[in-house]
Structures are given as C-alpha cells and as structure tokens.
C-alpha cells in the first residue's frame, strides 16, 4: 500500500489482526522496520540460511506482537490504544518501499437494551416512547427501528401511537449495527401498552 | 407525501453569517435523523454531519467543526443550518437529507445556494 | 476516514449499451449505497445496502460487491441514465461519497 493511500484496516477489540505487507519481487531484503505513530515497533533482518533476527523495539506491544513469515505484522489482543498509523520500510540494496496502513479498533455490540416511557391517553390510545442503547456505543454505531419490514426511525429513539381497538399486535425491533457486528431486539406493543394501562388504572382506583 | 423544503439562496459577504431552514412534512419528524450535506461549484458532495432530531444532539465532521452549527425547532419540524464567519469557500449548495437508517439518505431537499462575495 | 474511489471518472456510452460503474473503499465497509444527480437537480435515492433498489428506480439498475469493492451496473443505458452518480458508504463516521462517475452520451 502505497504511502500516498494508507490502507485502512478494521480490527476487533481483543482479536487479532494482520497488516499484510508486499514483497518486492526478487529483491533480496536488506531489513525491515515496522513503526506505530511514528516510534520504532520492530526491526527485522531476514536471512536466507536461518531464522530472522526480530528486534521488538516497543515493549508496550511487544508481547502481543509476531510476524508472518512474509514479515507481515500481527497484533493480539488487540486495545483500543492499538488505533493509529503503522508503517512498514523494506529496505533492499537499491530501493527503500513504505507501506502505511490505518487501523480503527472497532467494538463488537454487545448488551442491546430497551427502554419504555410511554403513556396511555383518555382514548384508549397508548404512546410508545422507545430507547434502544448498547454498551460503550460510539458514532460508528448506526440505530433504526423496524416493523413489519419497514425503518420507522433511524435514531435510537422511536415515538409511536398504538390504538389497540384498529391495531393488530405488533412488534417493534430496533437494530443496532457498526461495521463488525449487528444486535437486535423487539418489544410488543401489546404488551408494553397493557403494562401502561395496569398503572393507568391503578392511578385512577 | 413526504418531503424537505429548504429555505431560499443567499448572496452574504466574507465575515458574515447565514441560517439555511430545512422544513419537513409527511413524516414524524422527530424519528429520523437530519443529516447536512455540502456541494461546492462543480464539485463532490460532502457529508457535513447530522442532528439527532428527537434529542437535539448535533454531530459534526471534523472539517465542519467550529463555524457550522445544526439546530432544530421541532415544533415546526425544521431543521437549521447556521455558518458564521464566512469565507468565499463556503460557496456552495447545502442540502438537507432524511436518514432512513444506516445513513441511508432517502428524502433530500431542493438545496440552498449560498454565495459568499464581496 | 474511509476514501471510497470511484471510476472511472467519466464514461462515455451510448444508449443501449451497457455501464459498469466502481466504488472502491480503502477499508472494507458493511453496505455502499448510491445516488443519482442531475445538473441543477439535488441529489436522488438510487441504490441502498448494496442491491436494494430505491422506490421507482427500473431493474436495468443493479448493484453488487462487498468489502472494499462494489458496482454500479446499468444493463442498457436510457436516455434519462445520462448522469452522475456517487458512491456512499455508512460503516464509518465521517459517512464519506466517492467523488461520483458521470455517465455521459458517446
């Protein structure tokens, strides 16, 4: 990946990750040097006959760090602290070829929760107002709500009349969605509207 | 049926401010969120953030951080766009959008041409 | 921020022939989205999460990829094709546009 560009690469927290690195063809590789943010991470010679030598030069990542036998880095257990910019230099008797790479440390979704405030009117008709929250969600988390197929809104909140007299029982699910993973979960109109109204007439008695 | 209607262009001068209204219909306003979208003369277009329209929370991209301000009125379903300090730079078409979720932009509005000019 | 690249930068057909149009991301994303723009026009709801059609749009337009690499293909061009359209994708905050294809009359 060229310098220009850096390849933007997903990881997931406390999974591992590869940053692939590209040879160039028939060259003979002198070192390479792996940087994170621009500090020294490792320093490698190959060599024909025997194993590398691998200098791990960063000890914060050093024992979560090893490398592929093309050289590529491979980062466990990955923290969120491990988001940044990585270079590779492979440096050859007649070249020196960089290789940038970004890389975002995503959150699996986990804990999808929904909460109700809702209201029941004079009429009958029951007004849903729906939460839905996940843990340690950041902005690259996307929300909506859906019924029978159809978005109803695409925030993590939903109001909603239900009129139980002309509506059939229906479920609202909610989605919760970032680029490594997706949780959902659905409530009953029916049933949160005939919580709201055992309170309504506890109220009025 | 289901619509943004923004308000009309704006010749301002460098240093000046402008407030651009996005009003929607047809739809409870309050479930979708509202996203700003930028357009300079011949040019891309550019996601400029999004108003969570039920808490009123903005969000900006990093390059529209600072002068650039999104608010609501949602007793009238509008959304505002404000620029203060302007610079010949924010020449351009602004436009509203519905997110239908996954930032999915379904609905837009006619766009709002901003000229800046001494 | 993901840069998604889209080409080529103008293509130039006739009608009746086909179009295949490129969103190329710098990171994998979960769905890419397109839009169709006209002069003067704002921009139209095209395609959603990667294949779904947007309400009106005729089965001449389809969409395909995944990961890094999607597709715009338009099967036999009409007159009313002649536009330019733009890649968008919601995996990753800022939600960036590719830099649009303009679809232009050989």
């Known amino acids: 990946q060229s310098s220009l560009t850096p390849l933007m690469v997903n990881g997931i927290l406390g999974e591992s990750v590869t940053l692939p690195l590209e040879f160039p063809a028939g060259e003979k590789v002198n070192f390479i040097t792996w940087l994170f943010n621009e500090t020294s991470l490792a320093f490698i010679v190959p060599h024909e006959t025997k194993s590398p030598e691998i200098h791990v030069t960063n000890p914060k990542q050093g024992k979560r760090l090893n490398f592929t036998q093309s050289y590529s880095l491979q980062l466990s257990n990955l923290k969120m602290e491990d988001t940044g910019s990585y270079r590779a230099q492979i440096s050859t008797k007649t070249s020196a070829k960089l290789s940038s790479y970004t890389l975002r440390i995503l959150r699996q979704l986990r804990n999808i929760q929904v909460t109700n405030h809702s209201q029941l009117f004079q009429n009958m008709t029951c007004e849903l107002h729906l939460t839905c929250s996940v843990e340690d969600a950041d902005d690259n988390v996307s929300f909506r709500w859906e019924a029978l197929g159809n978005t109803l809104s695409s925030q993590p909140n939903l109001t909603v009349s239900w009129d139980p007299r002309i509506s059939s029982e229906q479920d609202y699910t909610c989605i919760a969605e970032n680029a490594v993973s997706n949780l959902s979960f659905s409530v009953s109109a029916q049933k949160l509207c005939e919580d709201v109204k055992i309170q309504y007439t506890d109220t009025k008695m | 049926q289901i619509q943004l209607v923004q308000s009309g262009s704006e010749l301002k001068k460098p240093g000046a401010s402008v407030k651009v209204s996005c009003k929607a219909s047809?739809?409870?306003?309050?479930?979708?969120?509202m996203n700003w979208v930028r357009q300079a003369p011949g040019q891309g277009l550019e996601w400029m953030g999004w108003?969570?329209?039920?808490?009123?929370?903005?969000r900006y991209a990093d390059d529209f951080k600072g002068r650039f301000v999104f608010s609501l009125d949602k007793s009238v379903s509008t959304a505002y766009l404000q620029i203060s300090s302007l610079k010949a730079e924010d020449t351009a078409v602004y436009y509203c959008?519905?997110?239908?979720?996954?930032?999915?932009?379904?609905?837009w509005g006619q766009g709002t041409t901003v000229t800046v000019s001494s | 921020q993901i840069v998604l690249s889209q080409s080529p930068a103008t293509l130039s057909l006739s009608p009746g022939e086909r179009a295949t149009l490129s969103c190329r991301a710098s990171?994998?994303?979960?769905?890419m989205h397109w839009y169709q723009q006209k002069p003067g026009q704002a921009p139209r709801p095209w395609i959603y999460?990667?294949?779904n059609l947007a309400s009106g749009i005729p089965a001449r337009f389809s969409g395909s990829g995944s990961g890094t690499d999607y597709t715009l293909t338009i099967s036999s061009l009409e007159p009313e094709d002649f536009a330019v359209y733009y890649c968008q994708q919601w995996s990753s905050t800022p939600r960036t546009f590719g830099g649009g294809t303009k679809v232009e009359i050989k």
């Open positions: 108003i969570n329209t039920y808490s009123g929370e903005p």
């Open positions: 999460a990667t294949s």
């Open positions: 990171s994998s994303v979960s769905h």
């Open positions: 959008a519905r997110d239908y979720g996954r930032w999915y932009f379904d609905v």
């Open positions: 047809g739809y409870t306003f309050t479930n979708y969120g």
